[in-house]
């Protein structure tokens, strides 16, 4: 211990510093750096002392603040406090302060604690400084946010005299009908299917499914992930420290979806997934998971119902021939709800209406998924509209374009089914949401989820 | 030439069954909810049943329920409506009748902008 | 369900005249109101929806007003072909409803 024998003379307190084998003495009215020995000269006796007083030099190591003070701390000294950084504590700041022992990182995030700081490492699925966001919604194969065009391959099985095509766009999760998959054709020796994300997106997982061909199961049973900015130059997701493609674990039938996690994630714009071992054809639907770059854009609750049905409001509601029980009320505008009325359908076809969600608290929402419906067999869907935002309920504003200064009018759907994604950025901080519909086919009809985050770093 | 016409009417025993088809001509059918609308001799008009465009969603009034069944054949461009149980009140024209639909606007309600020329049920004894 | 009354069950115009039909319904129907016109031995056509747009190649002289329970349809000036049955429904509730018909004859 540098302190032990103590150093400093004449009463001093010996402060072991930072760097091995350093110390700094605090001494006692009257003496003086270093070691204590220096007396404080006296001029005459009508004069004070000339010491600058107990702050100079600092006595606060780690950019702490020295204020004089004129009452005794109650501990060792006398005429100051040091007022210290974040991350540093202890009479003179000394202590570098361990950010771990709170347990900052969330969702089995791992904590290194840094000089007055802190890092987490979060799992694929979540990020953030303190892995508060979760990152493992479906980017939209199988809801249809990513379109056909986006959906590549390196080849289509054709079938029956070429009049079935295996097309890539069929591989979409949960996909129903007689020819609902991709498959490869039989003579592509290094078969590949990729997504253009159309931005830069974090992909922390993937989930795969074959499918029935001529009543037999095909499936993917072993692949390989292989990712890409600029859709030209690709990089294999490799096993974690080492050069090795990380061969992932595919499907054991035709049906049951199954998942795999990217830890680390991938951050890329194309993904593209090279089929390893497969059952006769190679023949996928899939779905990829992950969220925008910023995080921040998971679903906030309408499809989970976690918002509640008392949270959303409309302007007016519609009943079919005015029957009870096909009333479309805004309790039923959650994405993917499934029955005969599934869906909020205004009372009146005009600009003036308006579907809202009461978040509770002030909430960064950073996307808006809408979807249409049908009535009867009728399809009906808003195809544009705008967005308000307030935090009483009662003052509104209409979300703006920033460029043009002016309201900004999002697309909406063009049928009952399509999720149809809109990224809002820069992102809503307020309560409530109002969708406000500016055209539509049929009648007004919504069913949405909002996508943002309620913690706020 | 847009135009419906029925077929299948006739005489009925009461209690015994028929069945009235409408075939559909010049508009794309499948995209239409069709209906049936009877009319009793010298009454009024009284709506009978109604079907989706997909066949999958039906409605019927109260007076012909779990007796009549509303179907359609989307393939042959064909409505149906099956007929069991016959009462003598259901002695009438039977029509049958599509629904307003503007395919551009998307716009639909329940009244009826094409109707056939109507096929006699008559039930006696 | 919402009774449909159109008055007069009868109503004698002549040629080149004014004609006025009354429908009323039980309870309000906002404008859910149809009318339709059918000659002997053909099937119904549709008039007025909406209580007063013309339906395609509908001619101007009919016309459609009201709103709630009140209803009116007007033919402003009778031609030869306009002389038949005339009957208003509503779409308004579950079951569809017709009126009872009024007939329109040569004066």
């Known amino acids: 211990d540098i302190c032990d024998p103590n150093p400093c003379e004449n009463g001093g307190i010996c402060l072991p510093g930072l760097a091995d084998g350093s110390f700094s003495c605090e001494c006692p009215d009257g003496f003086t750096d270093p070691n204590c020995s220096s007396v404080v000269e006296v001029a005459s006796d009508e004069e004070e002392p000339t010491s600058a007083g107990p702050c100079t030099p600092n006595p606060c190591h780690n950019g702490g603040t020295c204020e004089i003070s004129e009452a005794y701390r109650g501990d060792t000294f006398i005429g100051y406090v040091c007022k210290c950084p974040r991350g540093f504590n202890g009479i003179h700041c000394q202590h570098n302060i361990n950010e771990c022992e709170v347990e900052p990182c969330k969702n089995g995030g791992i904590c290194t604690d840094l000089v007055a700081n802190y890092s987490c490492e979060c799992p694929g699925e979540f990020m953030g400084r303190n892995c508060q966001y979760k990152c493992s919604g479906p980017l939209g194969i199988e809801g249809g946010i990513i379109s056909n065009q986006q959906i590549t391959a390196s080849s289509t099985h054709r079938a029956l005299f070429g009049l079935q095509k295996w097309y890539p766009y069929y591989a979409r999760l949960n996909k129903k009908g007689l020819i609902n998959a991709w498959t490869a054709a039989e003579n592509d020796r290094w078969p590949w299917i990729q997504i253009n994300l159309q931005r830069k997106m974090r992909v922390t997982g993937v989930i795969t499914q074959g499918a029935k061909r001529i009543g037999s199961p095909e499936y993917i049973k072993s692949y390989k992930i292989a990712y890409s900015n600029d859709g030209k130059t690709w990089a294999m997701y490799k096993v974690k420290g080492t050069n090795e493609d990380m061969v992932f674990r595919g499907n054991i039938d035709n049906n049951t979806p199954y998942a795999n996690s990217f830890t680390p994630p991938i951050k890329a714009q194309y993904v593209r997934l090279y089929p390893q071992v497969c059952r006769r054809h190679c023949t996928l639907r899939m779905e990829l998971l992950g969220c925008e770059l910023s995080g921040c854009s998971e679903p906030l609750g309408m499809k989970s119902g976690h918002i509640q049905d008392y949270q959303i409001t409309a302007s007016s509601i519609f009943r079919t021939l005015n029957m009870d029980m096909f009333t479309w009320e805004p309790r039923k505008a959650r994405l993917d709800k499934q029955g005969k009325v599934n869906a909020w359908t205004s009372g009146h076809n005009d600009q003036s209406q308006w579907l809202q969600v009461d978040l509770l608290v002030p909430t960064k929402v950073t996307g808006i998924i809408t979807q249409g419906a049908k009535d009867f067999g009728h399809v009906q869907f808003v195809g544009s509209y705008k967005l308000a935002y307030s935090n009483d309920g009662e003052h509104w504003t209409v979300y703006q374009d920033e460029k043009q200064r002016k309201d900004k009018v999002f697309q909406g759907n063009f049928d009952n089914d399509t999720h149809r994604k809109n990224v809002i950025d820069p992102p809503i901080y307020a309560r409530h949401i109002r969708i406000l519909p500016w055209s539509w086919y049929g009648r007004i009809t919504l069913r949405s989820e909002l996508l943002g985050c309620t913690e706020e770093e | 030439e847009v135009q419906l016409l029925e077929s299948g009417g006739g005489l009925g025993q009461p209690g015994g069954s028929l069945r009235l088809s409408c075939a559909a001509s010049?508009?794309?059918?499948?995209?239409?909810?069709m209906n049936w609308v009877r009319q009793a001799p010298g009454k009024g008009l009284e709506w009978v049943s109604a079907?989706?465009?997909?066949?999958?969603?039906?409605y019927s009034t109260d007076s012909v329920k779990g007796r009549f069944t509303i179907s359609r054949d989307n393939s042959k461009n064909t409505l149906y409506l099956q007929m069991n149980s016959l009462r003598a009140e259901d002695t009438a024209v039977y029509y049958c009748?599509?629904?307003?639909?503007?395919?551009?606007?998307?716009?639909?309600?329940?009244?009826?902008?094409?109707w056939g020329q109507g096929t006699l049920v008559t039930v006696s004894s | 369900e919402i009774v449909m009354t159109l008055s007069p069950a009868t109503l004698s115009v002549s040629p080149g005249e004014r004609a006025t039909l009354s429908c009323r319904a039980s309870?309000?129907?906002?404008?859910?109101l149809a009318w339709y016109q059918q000659k002997p031995g053909q099937a119904p056509r549709l008039l007025i929806y909406?209580?007063?747009t013309r339906a395609t190649g509908i001619p101007a002289r009919f016309s459609g007003s009201g709103s709630g329970t009140e209803f009116t349809l007007t033919i402003s000036s009778l031609q030869s072909e306009d002389f038949a049955v005339y009957y208003c429904?509503?779409?308004?509730?579950?079951?569809?409803?017709f009126g009872g018909g009024t007939k329109v004859e040569i004066k």
């Open positions: 009748a599509k629904e307003y639909y503007d395919i551009l606007t998307g716009y639909w309600d329940w009244y009826f902008d094409l």
């Open positions: 010049g508009f794309t059918f499948s995209s239409y909810a």
């Open positions: 079907i989706s465009g997909s066949g999958d969603s039906t």
């Open positions: 309870q309000s129907i906002n404008s859910n």
């Open positions: 909406g209580a007063s």
């Open positions: 429904q509503q779409y308004n509730n579950w079951p569809l409803t």
